[in-house]
């Protein structure tokens, strides 16, 4: 049974990307407030967002203690003001978020082109390792140190005037590919979890072109 | 007349625990939110944690997170407050307090009970 | 967290003079969908627990005295005690109870010149 005037959360939604994790759920509340629970399957319910009028909690602070743990989230409704004024102080209405396993699930960022040096036929593409909000003794982890392995980035390069692209790929963050001396060439490079079903592959980096400013040239 | 006791205070060594209860009568208890607030000898209020009418959901100041626990035995009509790795900044009175026409609107509250934390 | 300041520290005022003391939060604590701001303010005497003046910035609790009034929007409030009477002399609190943690201002003390 639910308080009077109250309606449950729906739609709990988990938005994730680089474990940044933000729980979503409807409707706007009119003459409610929500509070929030996580939980891992094993572990004791904590609460977050406590008597919220927002319809999205953050949760990434609890999610990066351990991103390799299955959580679940529930969304409480609570009347707006005083329970004694509603009439009633039965259960408080909540629903269940979908399991979420950020190691799994959460959504690779978009990768930013660093710099690219070329040194005769060759050039090297960096791509930026980016910080994730996961600590460990007290420092941020790069997304390469939370996937290690797991994680390899694609690159996708072409002649600056040509449609034919290339590709190469890499398990660390950096491309050395082969080039004409005197083209330009563009590149784009996503990041890939090739071992995942969902959530594999991150949206596009900006292109970037030889002859912008993140390069360098050498003979 | 709504009426809430703390009692359980007293002094105790760094690193140890206490427990504090509020008892409450002269209201229907379990249709309330409750609160436990602290006030540092001459210093100014400070929140320190809640608990829903229901016991389901509690929420903790930062500085208590992990070493205080709320909870609420609505068949006693009783408040607590468990304190663990207690240090000499929790040296405080400590006041119980009931939600009003909203949550976190206090419309009534405890005489107090003192924790003094002291090698 | 929301930072509740409250200015002046202590303030002696006159008996039957009017006080006036202000509480800034660093974030607005109105609520759009209700215009309502979520302030509270309270009265401590010494020795005694806090008691509930004003809730919504300005609507005063039951069974408190009219000179009490309270007023302001967004993040900045005004607790006024029309005419101070003996009695009055005590430390005032805002509170904001928009977002958990609940959070203090430092208090005012109200002293009679």
């Known amino acids: 049974s639910g308080t009077t005037n109250t309606v449950a959360a729906y739609n709990l939604t988990w938005k994730s990307t680089n474990f940044k994790t933000i729980l979503e759920w409807e409707p706007k509340p009119v003459n409610q407030v929500y509070t929030v629970q996580i939980s891992t399957k094993s572990g004791d319910w904590k609460s977050k967002c406590f008597y919220t009028t927002d319809t999205e909690c953050d949760l990434t602070d609890e999610i990066v203690k351990d991103v390799k743990q299955t959580y679940l989230a529930r969304v409480f409704s609570y009347p707006a003001g005083n329970v004694e004024s509603t009439g009633s102080a039965g259960e408080p209405l909540y629903e269940n978020s979908p399991e979420f396993t950020p190691y799994l699930e959460t959504n690779l960022g978009q990768p930013t082109i660093q710099s690219f040096e070329q040194v005769g036929t060759k050039v090297n593409v960096t791509v930026e390792d980016e910080r994730t909000l996961v600590r460990r003794n007290n420092t941020f982890l790069s997304l390469r140190d939370v996937f290690g392995k797991d994680l390899i980035y694609t690159l996708y390069y072409w002649k600056d005037s040509s449609t034919g692209r290339k590709t190469n790929t890499t398990h660390t963050n950096e491309f050395l590919i082969d080039v004409e001396k005197g083209v330009s060439y563009c590149f784009f490079a996503q990041a890939v979890i090739p071992s995942r079903t969902v959530n594999r592959k991150s949206t596009d980096s900006p292109v970037e072109c030889m002859g912008q400013e993140k390069g360098e040239f050498r003979e | 007349q709504v009426q809430l006791v703390e009692s359980g205070g007293g002094v105790v060594q760094p690193g140890r625990s206490l427990r504090l209860s509020c008892a409450a009568s002269?209201?229907?208890?379990?249709?309330?939110?409750m609160h436990w607030v602290r006030q540092a000898p001459g210093k100014g209020l400070e929140w320190v944690a809640v608990?829903?009418?229901?016991?389901?959901?509690?929420y903790y100041a930062d500085s208590v997170e992990g070493r205080f626990t709320i909870s609420r035995d609505n068949s006693k009509n009783t408040l607590y407050l468990q304190m663990n790795s207690l240090r000499a900044e929790d040296t405080a009175v400590y006041y119980c307090?009931?939600?009003?026409?909203?949550?976190?609107?206090?419309?009534?509250w405890g005489q107090g009970t003192l924790v003094t934390v002291s090698s | 967290d929301i930072v509740m300041t409250q200015s002046p520290d202590s303030l002696a005022v006159s008996l039957g003079e009017r006080a006036t003391i202000n509480c800034k939060s660093s974030?607005?604590?109105?609520?759009?969908?209700?215009?309502?701001?979520?302030l509270a303010w309270y009265q401590q005497k010494p020795g005694q627990p806090p008691k509930l003046l004003i809730y919504w910035a300005s609507t005063r609790e039951s069974g408190v005295p009219d000179r009490f009034s309270g007023s302001g929007s967004g993040t900045d409030f005004t607790l006024t005690i029309s005419s101070l009477q003996a009695e009055d002399v005590a430390v005032y609190y805002c509170q904001q109870f928009h977002s958990y943690p609940l959070t203090f201002g430092g208090g005012t003390k109200v002293e009679i010149k």
């Open positions: 608990i829903t009418y229901d016991g389901i959901n509690k």
């Open positions: 307090a009931r939600d009003g026409v909203y949550y976190g609107v206090y419309d009534y």
């Open positions: 974030q607005s604590v109105l609520f759009s969908s209700n215009n309502k701001n979520y």
């Open positions: 002269g209201f229907t208890f379990r249709s309330y939110g």
